[in-house]
């Protein structure tokens, strides 16, 4: 059965450059290993932001990526990307691969447009 990946269409990053959004897939397959990849689309280019494999025991992901974190629960991944700046504004896609047990499935969300606004620099204080 085809898997559908859903994610919010728009998210606004915080003033500290942190954006969080869920990535969910359905139907909920009985899967021991799920690989989640966050991709950024700019024009026709697609680049990997971060990727991780979640398991029943390993529900905290992206340990190799300083700017990504995520938690996995059943068929929902809560993703957080930090260190974002205005130039990072763009469409972020969530790709889900059901790795084990077989069969392998792949699904892709439609993307979350993350808007990042750089904070205004603090004015110099005169004493």
């Amino acid at each position: 059965e085809a898997i559908q990946v859903t994610q919010p269409s728009v998210v606004l990053a915080s003033s500290h450059g942190v954006a969080s959004f869920p990535c969910e897939y359905s139907p909920s397959h009985n899967t021991d290993e799920v690989r989640v990849t966050v991709l950024r689309q700019t024009n026709d280019q697609m680049t990997e932001v971060c990727a991780t494999t979640f398991t029943e025991k390993n529900t905290v992901g992206f340990l190799d990526y300083p700017f990504c974190s995520g938690t996995f629960n059943e068929s929902r991944v809560n993703l957080t990307i930090q260190g974002l700046r205005a130039v990072d504004t763009g469409l972020y896609l969530c790709k889900v691969e059901l790795m084990y047990p077989p069969p392998y499935f792949v699904g892709m969300g439609n993307g979350t447009q993350i808007y990042v606004i750089d904070p205004e620099p603090c004015p110099d204080s005169d004493f």
């Epitope: 059965e1 697609m46 680049t47 990997e48 790795m99 069969p103 499935f105 792949v106 892709m108």
Partner: antibody, heavy 123, light 107 residues
């Protein structure tokens, strides 16, 4: 240039075993997933098995599950297909093919193929 | 398993003709579809991946389109070297099934 050369085919009796090899050259073997695809005489293509670039995942067609095992030896740049409990319907040309393991939107596809090795299962 | 069907199973055409081959999946496979060309006694050759991406070195007269369950391979102007059998393949889920093939021969 990319080269894939299959070997190990031949005539074998039903119920027996055979191991096919695929020697790869011209690319970084350990960076690619690898597939086996077969083609019975006068028939179409049938996907058999795939092994991920790092050997972490292996998937099989239902028709060979439990009888065939795909493996790889990156130190020898070689892909293998161990076939056991062979049946007449396994008679085919067996192709190995490489697949870029990291496909963002493209899925997995076989971009280079060997010329194939013929396996005939007959008593 | 996902079943792939192709139509027509065979067709006769002349050099210069526009040829269209269709492939249908038994369930949605997004854009995870590839097209291969095979000539007698030869290994298959990748033409199109991801439904519409042209493989490097493949002539631009080949194009692919479609998404979901219905896909098309088009040869805009058939050349003598294009007479062959064409297969579609889904890579959405294992087993990565092929279609039964479409044989293109000379009218």
């Amino acid at each position: 240039q990319v080269q894939l050369v299959e070997s190990g085919g031949g005539v074998v009796q039903p119920g027996r075993s055979l191991r096919l090899s695929c020697a790869a050259s011209g690319f970084t073997f350990s960076s690619y997933g690898m597939h086996w695809v077969r083609q019975a005489p006068g028939k179409g293509l049938e996907w058999v098995a795939v092994i991920w670039y790092d050997g972490s995942y292996k998937y099989y067609a239902d028709s060979v599950k439990g009888r065939f095992t795909i493996s790889r030896d990156d130190s020898k740049n070689t892909l293998y297909l161990q076939m056991s409990s062979l049946r007449a319907e396994d008679t085919a040309v067996y192709y190995c093919a490489r697949a870029p393991h990291y496909a963002i939107l493209t899925g997995y596809y076989e971009d280079y193929w060997g010329q194939g090795t013929l396996v005939t299962v007959s008593s | 398993d996902i079943q792939m069907t192709q139509s027509p199973s065979s067709l006769s055409a002349s050099v210069g003709d526009r040829v269209t081959i269709t492939c249908r999946a038994s369930q949605s496979i997004s854009s995870y579809l590839n097209w291969y060309q095979q000539k007698p006694g030869k290994a298959p050759k990748l033409l199109i991946y991801a439904a519409s991406s042209l493989q490097s070195g493949v002539p631009s007269r080949f194009s692919g389109s479609g998404s979901g369950t219905d896909f098309t391979l088009t040869i805009s102007s058939l050349q003598p070297e294009d007479f062959a059998t064409y297969y579609c393949q889904q890579s959405y889920s294992t087993p990565f099934t092929f279609g039964p093939g479409t044989k293109v021969d000379i009218k």
